[in-house]
Interface confidence: low
C-alpha cells in the first residue's frame, strides 16, 4: 500500500507499545504536571521525555475504539454517529455547547452532507482571553458562528490527506487553514496541534486540537509593517530587499528580531552590518527558515537550516521554545498567509556577517587574538581584506605567551594568510602565502587536515571578508632544510656528523618531504656499546641505520591519528603512534615532535632506532668498545658547522686501533 | 610612531565658526576610526564625535548635531572638526583621537589638544 | 545614554600603598556574545592629554605597568593600583564603548595623602 504519513507511523509505533494491555491499546506519553499528551515514537519512548520535561506513559483506546466491559483492551469500535455527537466522544462538549448557541450550525452537523471538524478541545476554549470569548457570544452570536464555520472544512479530510504545507478551505469565507505535518508525527492546524484525529462520523470526521483557531488575513511583510516592535527589522528589510520574498507566496518561518534584540548589539557591530548590503542579508537570512514551523511541532531538539545556509538548533524547554539552547523566543506562531513568525529578543548574527575578530569572540582564541591586537594586527582582522586567520586555541598558551618583539609579530604575520579559504577545498601539498611572506604547505591525513606543524581543531568560521581556523597549536614556519635545523641545533651534531659521512647530507638538503627521527648526540651516548660498535663499522650500515629514521613523506604530530606505519628511506615501516599527546616511533617516546623544515620535519628522539634485521642478535665478531671515540671526534668537527666533514678516512684509523 | 598633531587655539564670538584640525602620522591613516573628545575647563571627558575610517559614517553627541561637522582627508591624512553656531558652553580643550584598529571604539591614542575659547 | 558613575570623587592614598576606585555603568557593558565587556579606563594629568591604562575592562594597554588592574564585569568595575608610585597621582576616567553616545564616568582624583 502507499506509504504511512509520519502521524501514521508514530500511531503505530503507541499502538505496537499499547498492544500487551489489549488489542486497540494505545500508550500515550503525558507530560508531568500538565495536561498535555503525545502519541510516543521510538526516541520520546526511551527518553521519556517531551521538551527537557518528564512524562509518564498512560494506556489509552487507540481513536475510533472503546472498551467492553470484562474485557481485555478496546476491542469494540465506537458506534457511528453524526458529528455534533461525535463532538461529545471526542471530548469536545464546550463546542458542542457553542454550536447549539448558533442555532443554524448544530442542524447542519447532524444533517446530510460530508464535513470535517477541527474541534477545539475543553482546555482551548477555557484558555481563550475572557474579552476574546465575549466577542465571539455577542452580537446575535454572528461572530461565533463565523469562529465555528472557520474550523470546518466542507468535505471528509483524514490525517492521510494532510501534507505538509497544504491549505484547506474553511467553511468560514473560503478563507485558508494551514496544514503542516511533520516528521515527528505532529500535524498542525494554524499551528493548533491535533490530539486525537480521525474520529469518524455518519457524515463526515472530527480531529480534536488544542487551540480555537482564526482567520490568517497578513503575510510575514504586513505583519513587521503593523508591529510597532519591529521598526528596526522593518527598516533593515527594506535596506535589504527582502520584503518582495516575505510578501509572496511560499512557506516561511521568521525568527523576527524585536527592536530590543538589535539594541542588544554594540553600536560599532550593527552600525558595520547595516552599512554592508551582503552582510545585512546574510544577517536577515539568518533568521528565516525554509518552511513554516510551528512551536508545537517541536519536542526535542531539531536542526534546522536557515536560508543564510546556518544550522540553529530549534528546542524547547517546558513551554519556552529555544534556539540554539537559549530561550529567547519572546512570542511564538503568529500566523501569516505565507508562513509564521516567531518574534525573538536575540539577534542571530550568522558567521558570515562577523568580522575575524567577532568570530574569533565566540571561539576558544582569545589569547590568540588579544596577541594579534598587541602586534598591531588588528587592522587585518577587523577590515575587508580576504584573509584567513590560523588562530592557536587557548589551551596552547596555558603555560604564558610570548612577549611582542620583532620575532613575535612576525610569528603572528605568519598565522594570516592572503587569501579566505575554506578547509573542504585544501588540498595536499597546496602552498598557502602569508602576510610575512612564507610559504606554508597543507597536509591532509585521514583525520586531519594540517598546515606545517598545526593542524585544524574544529570547523572553519567563514566570515564576511575573513575565515577563520582554530588551530591546535602555535604554527612554527620552516626556517630551513632538515639539514639546517640540525646543524642550527648542538643536540645534533653527532648525527649531522653521521649523516655527512653515510653521505646522506645532499639528500636531506635538497627539496623533497621527510620525516626525520632525529636522535640526540645523549641517544648515540646511550647506545651499547656493540651497538655503537656495529653502528660505526661500516659506512654502509650506518646510512642503513640513518635512513630508518627518515620516513618518505611527511608526517606531524597531528596527522597520526592512533597508529601510523611510515615506510623509512631503509625500506622498512617505522610504527608511529599517538597516545595521551605522546608521539611515539616504534613504542620510544619522541621528545621534542614537529620542527618543521622546508623539505621536511624533524621529531627529536632519545634513542637511535633498529632496523627489524638490525635488532641485537649476538655475534662473534664484536668490534671494540673504543668505537665511541668516533662520537668525541664527530662531536667536535660537527660544531663547525659550516664546514663539510668527511669522516671516511677518520673510521680507517679507528677501526685500525680496535683490531686486536 | 603614532603622532596625531592639532592646530594651535583659537578665540571665537558666539554665532561664529572655526575649523580644527588635526595632522596624523606613524600609521595608515586610512585604517582607522577616528573621533574627537572634548574637555570643558575644570571638567570631565566628553565624546563628541566619530568618524569611520573611510569617512562614510560619522556620530555626533546630541549637545553638537548639527552644529559639528567631522571630516577627513586620507590624501593628506588629517582630520578635521568643524564647529559652527559656537556658544560659551563650548568652551573646551578638543582632543584628537585615534581609535585602537577599524572597528573597535576605545581611545588608543591622543593629540595634544586644542584649545577653542568662545566668548563675547 | 549609558550614564558611568565613579567612586569616590576623591582619593586620598600614601605612596606605596593601594589605590582602588569604582565605575557603575546605568546598564550592563557585557555583550553576551563574546563575553567582553566594553570599558577601558585613562589616566590624566594636568595640562596633559589622557593616556589609555586599560580596554576590555580588563586588558592591559602595550607599555602600561603591570600595577594597574582592572576588573569587574556588567555594570560594577574597579582599577586598582596595587603599590602607588609619585607619577601614578592624576585623574582617572573610566569609559564605556558599547553603546553611542561614548560616555565618561566624571573621573576620580588621586592625590597623595
Known amino acids: 500500500g502507499p506509504a504511512k504519513s509520519p502521524y501514521q507511523l508514530v500511531l503505530q509505533h503507541s499502538r505496537l507499545r499499547g498492544r500487551q494491555h489489549g488489542p486497540n491499546v494505545c500508550a500515550v506519553q503525558k507530560v508531568i504536571g500538565t495536561n498535555r499528551k503525545y502519541f510516543t515514537n521510538c526516541k520520546q519512548w526511551y527518553q521519556r521525555k517531551i521538551c527537557g520535561k518528564s512524562t509518564v506513559i498512560s494506556y489509552e483506546c487507540c481513536p475510533g475504539y472503546e472498551k467492553v466491559p470484562g474485557e481485555k483492551g478496546c476491542p469494540a469500535a465506537l458506534p457511528l454517529s453524526n458529528l455534533y455527537e461525535t463532538l461529545g466522544v471526542v471530548g469536545s462538549t464546550t463546542t458542542q455547547l457553542y454550536t447549539d448557541r448558533t442555532e443554524k450550525l448544530r442542524p447542519e452537523m447532524e444533517g446530510p452532507g460530508s464535513f470535517t471538524i477541527f474541534a477545539p478541545s475543553n482546555e482551548a476554549w477555557a484558555s481563550l482571553p475572557a474579552e476574546v470569548l465575549d466577542s465571539l457570544v455577542s452580537n446575535v452570536n454572528i461572530e461565533l458562528l463565523n469562529a465555528l464555520r472557520y474550523h470546518m472544512v466542507g468535505r471528509r479530510v483524514l490525517t492521510d490527506e494532510l501534507k505538509h504545507g497544504m491549505t484547506l478551505t474553511s467553511m468560514y469565507q473560503n478563507s485558508n487553514i494551514q496544514i503542516h505535518h511533520y516528521p515527528n508525527g505532529i500535524v498542525t492546524v494554524n499551528c493548533a496541534r491535533l490530539l486525537k484525529a480521525d474520529h469518524h462520523a455518519t457524515n463526515g470526521v472530527v480531529h480534536l486540537i488544542d487551540k480555537v483557531i482564526s482567520t490568517i488575513t497578513n503575510n510575514i511583510q504586513q505583519i513587521i509593517e503593523i508591529e510597532d516592535t519591529f521598526e528596526t527589522l522593518r527598516a533593515a528589510v527594506a535596506a535589504s530587499g527582502l520584503n518582495t520574498m516575505l510578501e509572496g507566496n511560499g512557506q516561511y518561518t521568521l525568527l523576527a528580531p524585536t527592536n530590543e534584540a538589535f539594541e542588544k548589539i554594540p553600536s560599532e557591530t550593527l552600525n558595520r552590518i547595516l552599512g554592508d548590503p551582503e552582510a545585512l542579508r546574510d544577517l536577515l537570512n539568518n533568521h528565516i527558515l525554509k518552511s513554516a514551523m510551528c512551536a508545537e511541532a517541536i519536542v526535542a531538539g531539531l536542526s534546522v537550516e536557515t536560508l543564510e545556509g546556518t544550522t540553529l538548533e530549534v528546542g524547547c524547554s517546558g513551554d519556552m521554545l529555544t534556539i540554539n539552547g537559549k530561550a529567547i523566543i519572546s512570542n511564538k506562531d503568529i500566523l501569516a498567509t505565507n508562513g509564521v513568525i516567531h518574534y525573538i529578543d536575540e539577534l542571530l548574527i550568522p558567521d558570515s556577517a562577523k568580522t575575524l575578530f567577532e568570530l574569533a569572540a565566540e571561539s576558544d582564541v582569545s589569547t590568540a587574538i588579544d596577541l594579534f591586537r598587541q602586534a598591531g594586527l588588528g587592522n587585518h582582522l577587523s577590515g575587508s581584506e580576504r584573509l584567513t586567520l590560523l588562530a592557536p586555541l587557548n589551551s596552547v598558551f596555558k603555560d604564558g605567551t610570548p612577549p611582542i618583539d620583532a620575532h613575535t609579530r612576525n610569528l603572528l604575520r605568519n598565522h594570516i594568510i592572503k587569501d579566505q579559504l575554506a578547509s573542504k577545498y585544501l588540498y595536499h601539498g597546496q602552498t598557502l602565502e602569508t602576510l610575512g611572506g612564507k610559504k606554508l604547505r597543507v597536509f591532509v591525513y585521514r583525520n586531519s587536515l594540517c598546515i606545517e606543524n598545526s593542524c585544524i581543531a574544529a570547523h572553519d568560521k567563514r566570515g564576511r571578508y575573513g575565515t577563520l581556523f582554530t588551530m591546535d597549536r602555535v604554527l612554527t614556519p620552516p626556517m630551513g632544510t632538515v639539514m639546517d635545523v640540525l646543524k642550527g641545533d648542538n643536540r645534533f651534531s653527532m648525527l649531522v656528523a653521521a649523516i655527512q659521512s653515510a653521505g646522506l647530507t645532499e639528500t636531506l638538503n635538497r627539496e623533497g618531504v621527510y620525516t626525520v627521527f632525529a636522535p640526540t648526540n645523549e641517544a648515540f651516548r646511550a647506545l651499547p656499546p656493540r651497538e655503537r660498535s656495529r653502528l660505526l663499522g661500516d659506512a654502509k650500515e650506518l646510512a642503513n641505520i640513518l635512513k630508518y629514521h627518515i620516513g618518505d613523506e611527511i608526517l606531524v604530530s597531528g596527522g597520526i591519528g592512533a597508529l601510523v606505519r611510515l615506510k623509512s628511506l631503509q625500506g622498512d615501516k617505522l610504527e608511529v603512534s599517538l597516545k595521551n599527546n605522546v608521539v611515539s616511533v616504534n613504542k620510544e617516546p619522541v621528545a621534542e615532535p614537529d620542527i618543521m623544515a622546508t623539505n621536511g620535519v624533524v621529531h627529536v628522539i632519545t634513542n637511535v632506532l633498529q632496523p627489524p634485521a638490525n635488532r641485537p642478535q649476538e655475534r662473534g665478531d664484536e668490534l671494540a668498545d673504543s668505537a665511541l671515540e668516533i662520537f668525541k671526534q664527530a662531536s667536535a668537527f660537527s660544531r663547525a658547522s659550516q664546514r663539510s666533514v668527511r669522516l671516511a678516512p677518520v673510521y680507517q684509523k679507528l677501526l685500525e686501533r680496535m683490531k686486536h | 610612531q603614532v603622532q596625531l598633531v592639532q592646530s594651535g587655539a583659537e578665540v571665537k564670538k558666539p554665532g561664529s565658526s572655526v575649523k580644527v584640525s588635526c595632522k596624523a602620522s606613524g600609521f595608515t591613516f586610512s585604517d582607522y576610526y577616528m573621533y574627537w573628545v572634548r574637555q570643558a575647563p575644570g571638567q570631565g571627558l566628553e565624546w563628541v564625535g566619530t568618524?569611520?575610517?573611510?569617512?562614510?559614517?560619522?556620530y555626533y553627541a546630541q549637545k553638537v548635531q548639527g552644529r559639528f561637522t567631522i571630516t577627513r582627508d586620507s590624501s593628506t591624512s588629517t582630520l578635521y572638526l568643524e564647529l559652527s553656531s559656537l556658544r560659551s558652553e563650548d568652551t573646551a580643550v578638543y582632543y584628537c583621537v585615534r581609535g585602537w584598529d577599524r572597528y573597535d571604539s576605545w581611545f588608543a591614542c591622543w593629540g595634544q589638544g586644542t584649545t577653542v575659547t568662545v566668548s563675547s | 545614554e549609558i550614564v558611568m558613575t565613579q567612586s569616590p570623587a576623591t582619593l586620598s592614598v600614601s605612596p606605596g600603598e593601594r589605590a582602588t576606585m569604582s565605575c557603575r555603568a546605568s546598564?550592563?557593558?557585557?555583550?553576551?556574545?563574546?563575553?567582553?565587556?566594553?570599558l577601558a579606563w585613562y589616566q590624566q594629568k594636568p595640562g596633559q592629554a589622557p593616556r589609555l591604562l586599560i580596554y576590555?575592562?580588563?586588558t592591559r594597554e602595550t607599555g602600561i605597568p603591570a600595577r594597574f588592574s582592572g576588573s569587574g564585569s556588567g555594570t560594577e568595575f574597579t582599577l586598582t593600583i596595587s603599590s602607588l608610585q609619585s607619577e601614578d597621582f592624576a585623574v582617572y576616567y573610566c569609559q564605556q564603548y558599547y553603546r553611542y553616545p561614548y560616555t565618561f564616568g566624571q573621573g576620580t582624583k588621586l592625590e597623595i595623602k
Open positions: 546598564q550592563s557593558l557585557l555583550y553576551s556574545s563574546n563575553q567582553k565587556n566594553y
Open positions: 576590555w575592562a580588563s
Open positions: 568618524i569611520s575610517d573611510g569617512g562614510i559614517y560619522a
